[in-house]
């Protein structure tokens, strides 16, 4: 029950996180005009990963896409790449995790297969979250650098008479959405990995008890396994993580410690 809850919660948290990463990637407000000393502006500039926008007092908003690929800063390209990789990994992770959910029955899929899929999706979510956090952080660092550079030469005088006000940009809403979403995806991934441990049958060694009866030795394995005959190096005396379907008896009699996580 605890495993199912952990897995389900991990899935939901990751789903929200990935939705947030997609939203952040599509948002136009990655950087917004810094309204230093001037909270009211007639022309407000903001920029995203794909286009830059200008909103006027008139209510008119104009957005222009970055129609060049080679002319864009390498850092921006890197951020785009990180966010897209994050989305792709997250989407694949979601797809895998749907089939891995304990509460969903798909044919005769064994618990070990579900455990593997849960682990895979968990790792994918973790990497996806890290990609998003990295992407947003790289962009934020770029903003901070540019902010202080433009502050240093805020006003570039022309003959000491005319002033050209340089537009400074600060953190936009998309950065915070990205950080939170990346964090949620990461947390969801960790939860999936924890759930995986609970889904996997334990690899516990059980020593066979030998009985010498009528010149015929029988080794008995506990937990509803069939007895194997003969002595010697009987490797089948182990509870092997063979993706094996555990019987109802086994589940009841020998609950895994991970079921109580």
């Amino acid at each position: 029950m605890a495993v199912t809850a952990c897995q389900g919660l991990g899935f939901v948290v990751s789903l929200i996180g990935i939705a947030g990463i997609i939203a952040a990637t599509c948002m136009d407000q990655w950087s917004t005009q810094d309204l230093y000393n001037n909270p009211v502006t007639a022309v407000f500039n903001y920029q995203g990963l794909w286009r830059s926008c200008v909103r006027e007092s008139s209510g008119f908003t104009e957005c222009r896409g970055y129609f060049t690929l080679l002319g864009l800063p390498a850092m921006l390209q890197a951020v785009r790449a990180l966010m897209i990789v994050g989305i792709v990994l997250g989407a694949i992770g979601l797809l895998v995790s749907i089939f891995a959910l304990k509460c969903i029955r798909i044919g005769s899929m064994e618990d070990s297969a579900k455990a593997n899929m849960t682990l895979t999706s968990g790792i994918m979510f973790i990497v996806s979250g890290l990609c998003a956090i990295a992407g947003v952080s790289v962009f934020a660092n770029m903003l901070v650098t540019n902010f202080w550079m433009s502050t240093a030469n805020m006003y570039t005088g022309m003959g000491g008479m005319v002033q050209t006000v340089q537009t400074r940009y600060t953190f936009g809403a998309a950065l915070f959405v990205g950080w939170v979403a990346g964090g949620l995806t990461l947390i969801g991934g960790v939860m999936m990995c924890i759930a995986c441990r609970g889904l996997a049958p334990e690899e516990t060694n059980y020593k066979a008890v030998s009985y010498h009866a009528s010149g015929h030795s029988v080794a008995y394995k506990p937990g509803g396994f069939k007895a194997s005959t003969g002595f010697g190096s009987n490797t089948k005396n182990k509870k092997i993580y063979d993706g094996g379907a555990r019987t109802e008896d086994e589940v009841q009699s020998y609950p895994s410690k991970h079921d109580y996580v």
Epitope: A42, V43, V54, G59, T164, T167
Partner: antibody, heavy 118, light 113 residues
């Protein structure tokens, strides 16, 4: 089409107050900034301030803070400007105008002449 | 505040002549975000409210004759009337629409001989 109809001219005594109205029609009144502009006889234009009727947000020219108070009534699609402590310097034609692309003022009222005289 | 300086303060021309008037701003009116200049030109005839001619420094308002052309960028702007007509007798104002408070130039009075 967009129309801005202003109240009639007024003669007021120094120290008194006057309230000018500007009734808008032909557009969504709440969605656009309404601007007020002053023009003294034979002089240039001065931006007094603006009001966003949707939420009552205002933005004033520092020169007119304390002099002009902008309000708006959404139900009647009317903007108001109250001028207080009037002096001869306040004798002017006051225009209401609606903001347009490029923050330009495309639609203008006919103007209200305020004369301050003892 | 951005100071707008217009020149000349008045000019007298003959109908059919080409006219140019200048407007200079104390700060650049060019917005880096959309590469647009937030400068507007108005025409005010006696006893009338101003009429919008040109916004974004060079975009002609609908209904404005194409003899009116706005040009310039940054801090230097020009309004050109390619062939002055009698009905163009008016005062022409430029305005900063880039930052608050919005400021107007003192105007250029156009008179016809």
């Amino acid at each position: 089409q967009v129309q801005l109809q202003q109240s009639g001219a007024g003669l007021v005594k120094p120290g008194a107050s006057v309230k000018i109205s500007c009734k808008a029609s032909g557009y969504a009144f709440s969605s656009y900034w309404m601007i007020w502009v002053k023009q003294r006889p034979g002089k240039g234009l001065e931006w007094i301030g603006q009001i966003y009727p949707g939420d009552g947000d205002t933005n004033y020219n520092g020169k007119f803070k304390g002099k002009a108070t902008l309000t708006a009534d959404k139900s009647s699609s009317t903007a108001f400007m109250q001028l207080s402590s009037l002096t001869s310097e306040d004798s002017a034609v006051y225009f209401c105008t609606r903001i347009y692309y490029g923050n330009a003022f495309a639609y203008w009222g006919q103007g209200t002449l305020v004369t301050v005289s003892a | 505040d951005i100071v707008m300086t217009q020149s000349p303060s008045s000019l007298t021309v003959t109908a059919g002549e080409k006219v140019t008037m200048s407007c200079k701003s104390s700060q650049s009116l060019l917005n880096s975000g959309n590469q647009k200049n937030y400068l507007t030109w108005y025409q005010q005839k006696p006893g009338q409210p101003p009429k919008l001619l040109i916004y974004w420094a060079s975009t002609r308002e609908s209904g404005v004759p194409d003899r009116f052309t706005g040009s310039g960028s940054g801090t230097d702007f020009t309004l050109t009337i390619s062939s002055v007509q009698a009905e163009d007798l008016a005062v022409y104002y430029c305005q900063n629409d880039y930052s608050y408070p919005f400021t107007f130039g003192s105007g250029t009075k156009l008179e016809i001989k």
